[in-house]
Interface confidence: medium
C-alpha cells in the first residue's frame, strides 16, 4: 500500500530507537572507512527529517524514496573521493542506478584494524559512561566489517550485548561473567553474517528463483505438516524479507520480517507445532526464535512421492501447465520426507528431476522414459553420505586443529593460487565442521555438514571474486550454486601451479608468538603449512607432518628459554635449513 | 473484493449427477487460486476440489477421486464442479471459495481463503 512518506511510515512502524539503528546499520555497511562520529552525525540528520515528515507527511522532500533520502546524505560526505575513490562516482548517478553502485562497492574484506576487546573495567567504565554510544559503537563496528549482515538480527545481537553488560558489569567477576558471553556473541555473529552472506549470494549472482528453491525446501523439512500453499506464501513472504535486505533496504526489511513473524505466529496452528515458545517472546527474540526453530514431526502416513511424480499419467500436463509450481511441490513433497538430507541435495534431486521431465515429455513414450527417474537419486545421495561418513572418521582420529591442517593441505594442494590468509580462514572454518556436525546422530549429520560447507566455500567465493587469481574457484563458484561442494571435493592437485619460490623470511618467527593465544598461534603455524605446501606441492603427508612436528617443538622449546629472541634466531635458521633438506626444496 | 455465487444444488438420487456453478464478479477467476468446500449437517467445513490460479493444475479429496471434476471458464468468470456416482454421504452445503494474491495454488484449508459464496445445498437421497 502507498504512503504519501515513506521515511514517515518507516519511522512509525519501526520506533525511533529501531529506526536509528537500522539507519546506522545502513550507512556503516555502505561506507565502512567512515569515522564512527561522522555516520552518527548523518544518523542524527535523517532521523530529525524523519521525524518532521511524521509531522507533516506532505512537508518538503518527505515524498522522495528512502535510496533517494540516504544516497542524497552518504554523497554529502566531503571526503568521499579521497576516501573511497571510485564509489565516489556513484553520486553521479540517478536512483536506483546509484544504489545499485554502492551495493556493487560493499567490501567483504575491508582494510580495517582487527577488533582488539579493550579490559573489561574499561568497557564497564565506556558503557557506564554512555551506554547509547557504547551500543551504537557496537553496531558501527560489526555492521562495517560485516556489510551484509542481517540487520533485524544485529538488532537482536546488540540487545543481547545490551543484556550481558547490564549483567556483568554489576557481578562480583565481571569477567568471568561477561567474556564467555562476549565470545559466544562474536562467533554467534561470526556464523550468522555467513550465513546471510549465502543468501545474498543466492539472490545476486543466482537469482529469485534460486533462493525460493532454497527457502522451499528449507521450510519444507521445519514445517512438514504445513501444505504446500502455506509453504509457498511463507516462502514469497521470506524472499522478499532478504531481497531488501540484501539490496539495503534495511528499513523494509525489518518491517517486513516483523509482519512475517506476526503472521507465522498468528498462524501457528497450519504451520508448526514447535512454535508456541517463540511466539511468547517479544519481537526480535521471536523473529530469532522462529529462524532457528527445530524441525517438526513429520505427519505420519505420508503416502509414497512416487504416485503423483512417476507414476501418474498427468505428470508430462501438470509439468507443462505450470513447471516452477509443479518442481516447487515436487521439492516440498521430497524435502517433508527428508529433514536428514541436506537442503543442496534436495535441490540437487529436483534440479535432476527436472532436466528428466524437460527430455522425456518432449519424448515419444514420456512415461516409460521418466519412470526410472528415482533410480538416478541414488548416486547423488550415497554421494555426501559417504563424503561425511570419512571426513568424520578422519576428525574423531585427528582431533580439530590436525583436522584443519589435512584440510589446509588438501585445499592449498587444489587451488595453491588463492591468497594465505584466505585459505588458512577456509580451511579452519571448513575444519569446525567436525566439531560442529559430526556427534550428531547419522539423521542430522548430513544437513548439519552439507549446509554448513556451502555457507564456508561462498566465504571463499566472495572472497576470490573481490580478487580472482584461480580459474578453478571461479568455475566451481559460478557454475551451479548447488554443485559447489561437489565441485570442490573433484577438484584435484593442480598439475599446472609453479611452486612459490622459497622465502626464508616466511618462516623466520620471533618472540612475540608465546604471548599469543593458543587460536593465534595456531594460525601461525597454519599459516607456515600453507606457504610449505606452495613451496612443495608434491610433499607427502608424512614430509609436512615431520615438518610441522619440529615446528612445534622449536616453539615451544624457544618459548621456555631465558633469552626468547636468540632463540628463535638461532634455533630458527637450523629449522629452515632441516625443513629445507626434509622437503628437499 | 471478489464477489462468488452459486448455484446448481438440488435432491438427486444416489448414483446420480449434478453440476455446481459459481460466478464470479471483481477479479478474473483464472488469477485465482478456487476451490470447492462443503460442509454437511454438524461437522466442519471440507475440502472438496481446488484449481490452482493462471494454471490448471487440480486437486481432489481423495473421498471424491474418480467421481467429481473441477473445472472453470474464464470467458464467463465461472467455476464449476461436475459430481457423478453421487453418494448419500456427499449431502452438504456446498461452497466456493477464493484466494487471490497466490496463483498457482489452491489449499485444503479453509481458512486461508479470504472470500467465500453464500452456498447451495445438494442433498443425496432415495
Known amino acids: 500500500d502507498a504512503h504519501k512518506s515513506e521515511v514517515a511510515h518507516r519511522f512509525k512502524d519501526l520506533g525511533e530507537e529501531n529506526f536509528k539503528a537500522l539507519v546506522l546499520i545502513a550507512f556503516a555497511q555502505y561506507l565502512q572507512q567512515c569515522p564512527f562520529e561522522d555516520h552518527v552525525k548523518l544518523v542524527n540528520e535523517v532521523t530529525e527529517f524523519a521525524k518532521t515528515c511524521v509531522a507533516d507527511e506532505s512537508a518538503e522532500n518527505c515524498d522522495k524514496s528512502l535510496h533517494t533520502l540516504f544516497g542524497d546524505k552518504l554523497c554529502t560526505v566531503a571526503t568521499l573521493r579521497e576516501t573511497y575513490g571510485e564509489m565516489a562516482d556513484c553520486c553521479a548517478k540517478q536512483e536506483p542506478e546509484r544504489n545499485e553502485c554502492f551495493l556493487q562497492h560493499k567490501d567483504d574484506n575491508p582494510n580495517l584494524p582487527r577488533l582488539v576487546r579493550p579490559e573489561v573495567d574499561v568497557m564497564c567504565t565506556a558503557f557506564h559512561d554512555n551506554e547509547e554510544t557504547f551500543l551504537k559503537k557496537y553496531l558501527y563496528e560489526i555492521a562495517r566489517r560485516h556489510p551484509y549482515f542481517y540487520a533485524p538480527e544485529l538488532l537482536f545481537f546488540a540487545k543481547r550485548y545490551k543484556a550481558a553488560f547490564t549483567e556483568c558489569c554489576q557481578a562480583a567477576d565481571k569477567a568471568a561473567c561477561l567474556l564467555p558471553k562476549l565470545d559466544e556473541l562474536r562467533d554467534e555473529g561470526k556464523a550468522s553474517s555467513a550465513k546471510q552472506r549465502l543468501k545474498c549470494a543466492s539472490l545476486q549472482k543466482f537469482g529469485e528463483r534460486a533462493f525460493k528453491a532454497w527457502a522451499v525446501a528449507r521450510l519444507s523439512q521445519r514445517f512438514p505438516k504445513a501444505e504446500f500453499a502455506e509453504v509457498s506464501k511463507l516462502v514469497t513472504d521470506l524472499t522478499k524479507v532478504h531481497t531488501e535486505c540484501c539490496h539495503g533496504d534495511l528499513l523494509e526489511c525489518a518491517d517486513d520480517r516483523a509482519d512475517l513473524a506476526k503472521y507465522i505466529c498468528e498462524n501457528q496452528d497450519s504451520i508448526s507445532s514447535k512454535l508456541k515458545e517463540c511466539c511468547e517472546k517479544p519481537l526480535l527474540e521471536k523473529s530469532h526464535c522462529i529462524a532457528e526453530v527445530e524441525n517438526d514431526e513429520m505427519p505420519a502416513d505420508l503416502p509414497s512421492l512416487a504416485a503423483d511424480f512417476v507414476e501418474s499419467k498427468d505428470v508430462c500436463k501438470n509439468y507443462a501447465e505450470a513447471k516452477d509450481v509443479f518442481l516447487g511441490m515436487f521439492l516440498y513433497e521430497y524435502a517433508r520426507r527428508h529433514p536428514d538430507y541436506s537442503v543442496v541435495l534436495l535441490l540437487r534431486l529436483a534440479k535432476t528431476y527436472e532436466t528428466t521431465l524437460e527430455k522425456c515429455c518432449a519424448a515419444a513414450d514420456p512415461h516409460e522414459c521418466y519412470a526410472k527417474v528415482f533410480d538416478e537419486f541414488k548416486p547423488l545421495v550415497e554421494e555426501p553420505q559417504n563424503l561425511i561418513k570419512q571426513n568424520c572418521e578422519l576428525f574423531e582420529q585427528l582431533g580439530e586443529y590436525k583436522f584443519q591442517n589435512a584440510l589446509l593441505v588438501r585445499y592449498t594442494k587444489k587451488v595453491p593460487q588463492v591468497s594465505t590468509p584466505t585459505l588458512v580462514e577456509v580451511s579452519r572454518n571448513l575444519g569446525k565442521v567436525g566439531s560442529k556436525c559430526c556427534k550428531h546422530p547419522e539423521a542430522k549429520r548430513m544437513p548439519c555438514a552439507e549446509d554448513y560447507l556451502s555457507v564456508v566455500l561462498n566465504q571463499l567465493c566472495v572472497l576470490h571474486e573481490k580478487t580472482p587469481v584461480s580459474d578453478r574457484v571461479t568455475k566451481c563458484c559460478t557454475e551451479s550454486l548447488v554443485n559447489r561442494r561437489p565441485c570442490f571435493s573433484a577438484l584435484e592437485v593442480d598439475e599446472t601451479y609453479v611452486p612459490k619460490e622459497f622465502n626464508a623470511e616466511t618462516f623466520t618467527f620471533h618472540a612475540d608468538i608465546c604471548t599469543l593465544s593458543e587460536k593465534e598461534r595456531q594460525i601461525k603455524k597454519q599459516t607456515a603449512l600453507v606457504e610449505l605446501v606452495k613451496h612443495k606441492p608434491k610433499a607427502t603427508k608424512e614430509q609436512l607432518k615431520a615438518v610441522m612436528d619440529d615446528f612445534a617443538a622449536f616453539v615451544e622449546k624457544c618459548c621456555k628459554a631465558d633469552d626468547k629472541e636468540t632463540c628463535f634466531a638461532e634455533e630458527g635458521k637450523k629449522l629452515v635449513a632441516a625443513s629445507q633438506a626434509a622437503l628437499g626444496l | 473484493e471478489v464477489q462468488l455465487l452459486e448455484s446448481g444444488g438440488g435432491l438427486v438420487q444416489p448414483g446420480g449427477s449434478l453440476r455446481l456453478s459459481c460466478a464470479a464478479s471483481?477479479?478474473?477467476?483464472?488469477?485465482?487460486?478456487v476451490a470447492w468446500f462443503r460442509q454437511a449437517p454438524g461437522k466442519g467445513r471440507e475440502f472438496v476440489a481446488g484449481?490452482?490460479?493462471?494454471?490448471?493444475?487440480?486437486y481432489y479429496a481423495d473421498s471424491v477421486k474418480g467421481r467429481f471434476t473441477i473445472s472453470r471458464d474464464n470467458s464467463k468468470n465461472t467455476l464449476y464442479l461436475q459430481m457423478n456416482s453421487l453418494r448419500p454421504e456427499d449431502t452438504a452445503v456446498y461452497y466456493c471459495?477464493?484466494?487471490?494474491?497466490?496463483?498457482?495454488?489452491?489449499?485444503?484449508?479453509?481458512?486461508?481463503?479470504?472470500?467465500w459464496g453464500q452456498g447451495t445445498l445438494v442433498t443425496v437421497s432415495s
Open positions: 484449481i490452482g490460479g493462471g494454471v490448471d493444475i487440480t
Open positions: 471459495a477464493a484466494r487471490p494474491g497466490r496463483p498457482l495454488i489452491t489449499s485444503k484449508q479453509a481458512s486461508l481463503y479470504p472470500y
Open positions: 471483481g477479479r478474473y477467476i483464472d488469477e485465482t487460486a
